[in-house]
């Protein structure tokens, strides 16, 4: 009998407004055995894989995704998804990055603090479940 | 299919150096953590070295018997994992495998390191 | 570090028997340990992973079970090839310490 898999939670380092020029890192978490996590943007039709996959704490693992340089068109809504053999998760809860001009005010703090986006009851697509992820994934660029 | 093939295994000297490289495909390569496993003649299995990937900032970690003088690292263009080892011991002699992580799911054939005067 | 226990070190059985062999962790890993099954002369082979969950292609005779610090490994109806070297691993942190293996012998 498959397992239910629990919905991933999504953060990013060091938080969710982000200078221009600066880095953010996504961080995806689901249950311990995940084989790829996948960060999605806006839509499905953007989206960047990793299987450098690393324990979070005993029951769960987590993936990160950097962006070493962030650009104006980086902002927008990003969500985790994540394959466990033999399925898919649900998505994530959007995270929403701002992307803003340095001020290089000294008393200016460059991000808010961290935040996140955890299992909620708001209905998602499950229509992932049927497909293993692509055998070649994906580059960077197809996201970043 | 999944491949993983070491090369460079070989006789050296106590104090000399070796570099030891393992050929990739069939997966991935520049998404997926790796790792390097030896296992000493009639013995057991030793983690050896890990690299993550550049989302992780290339980060490495090693077994305490190695630190200082192993260096792993890895080329993604050419999916190509490496073992950088200098002032090799006698206790170095083992078989070296080149691993893919996080779950250690794919090993290669191996490499023999024999470390004697 | 973390120290993996494994028992018993040569265990003798027969053909279509079960066996289990067990693993103990010096600390919590949660479910973040692998089985894994040598041939004479061969790589290893990844069996179960996650402590529970199957690899690709592995039969459903072999079985994980546990979690925390005390984990099972079992062969269900031995087939003359299991009787080979079996390992855990936790891989919960580095260094990601192995147990010392288990030698299936034949009755």
């Known amino acids: 009998q498959e397992e239910d898999l629990p919905r991933p939670s999504i953060s990013a380092e060091p938080g969710t407004v982000i200078p221009l020029g600066s880095h953010v890192t996504f961080v995806c978490r689901g249950p311990v055995g995940v084989q790829t996590f996948r960060l999605e943007r806006d839509s499905r039709s953007t989206y960047n894989d990793t299987e450098d996959v690393s324990q979070a704490s005993p029951s769960e693992s987590e993936a990160r995704f950097r962006i070493d340089s962030v650009r104006e068109g980086n902002a927008g809504l990003y969500r985790c998804i994540y394959y466990k053999p033999p399925k898919w998760s649900e998505q994530s809860d959007y995270l929403e990055l701002l992307v803003k001009e340095s001020s290089g005010g000294p008393d200016s703090p460059d991000t808010e603090p961290g935040s996140s986006a955890g299992p909620t009851q708001r209905p998602s697509d499950n229509s992932h479940n049927e497909h293993a992820p692509a055998s070649q994934g994906l580059k960077a660029e197809h996201l970043y | 299919e999944v491949q993983l093939v070491e090369t460079g295994g070989g006789l050296v000297q106590p104090k000399g150096s070796l570099k030891l490289s393992c050929a990739t495909s069939g997966f991935t390569f520049n998404i997926n953590a790796m790792n390097w496993v030896r296992q000493a003649p009639g013995k057991g299995l030793e983690w050896v070295a890990r690299?993550?990937?550049?989302?992780?900032?290339?980060?490495?970690y090693y077994a305490d018997s190695v630190k200082d003088r192993f260096t792993i690292s890895r080329d993604d263009s050419q999916s190509m994992l490496y073992l950088q080892m200098n002032n090799l011991k006698t206790e170095d002699t083992a078989m070296y495998y080149c691993?893919?992580?996080?779950?250690?799911?794919?090993w290669g054939q191996g490499t023999t390191l024999t470390v004697s005067s | 570090d973390i120290q993996m226990t494994q028992s018993p070190a040569s265990q003798s059985a027969s053909l279509g028997e079960s066996v289990t062999i067990t693993c103990l962790a010096s600390?919590?890993?949660?479910?973040?340990l692998a089985w894994y099954q040598q041939k004479p002369g061969k790589s290893p082979q990844l069996l179960i992973y996650a402590a529970t969950s199957l690899a690709d292609g592995v039969p459903s005779r072999f079985s994980g079970s546990g979690s925390g610090t005390k984990f099972s490994f079992k062969i269900s109806n031995l087939q003359a090839e299991d009787f080979v070297t079996y390992y855990c691993?936790?891989?919960?942190?580095?260094?990601?310490?192995f147990g010392g293996g288990t030698k299936l012998e034949i009755k």
């Open positions: 691993q936790q891989l919960y942190s580095t260094p990601y310490t």
């Open positions: 690299i993550r990937t550049k989302n992780n900032n290339f980060a490495t």
């Open positions: 691993v893919r992580g996080p779950y250690f799911d794919y």
């Open positions: 600390q919590t890993i949660g479910t973040w």
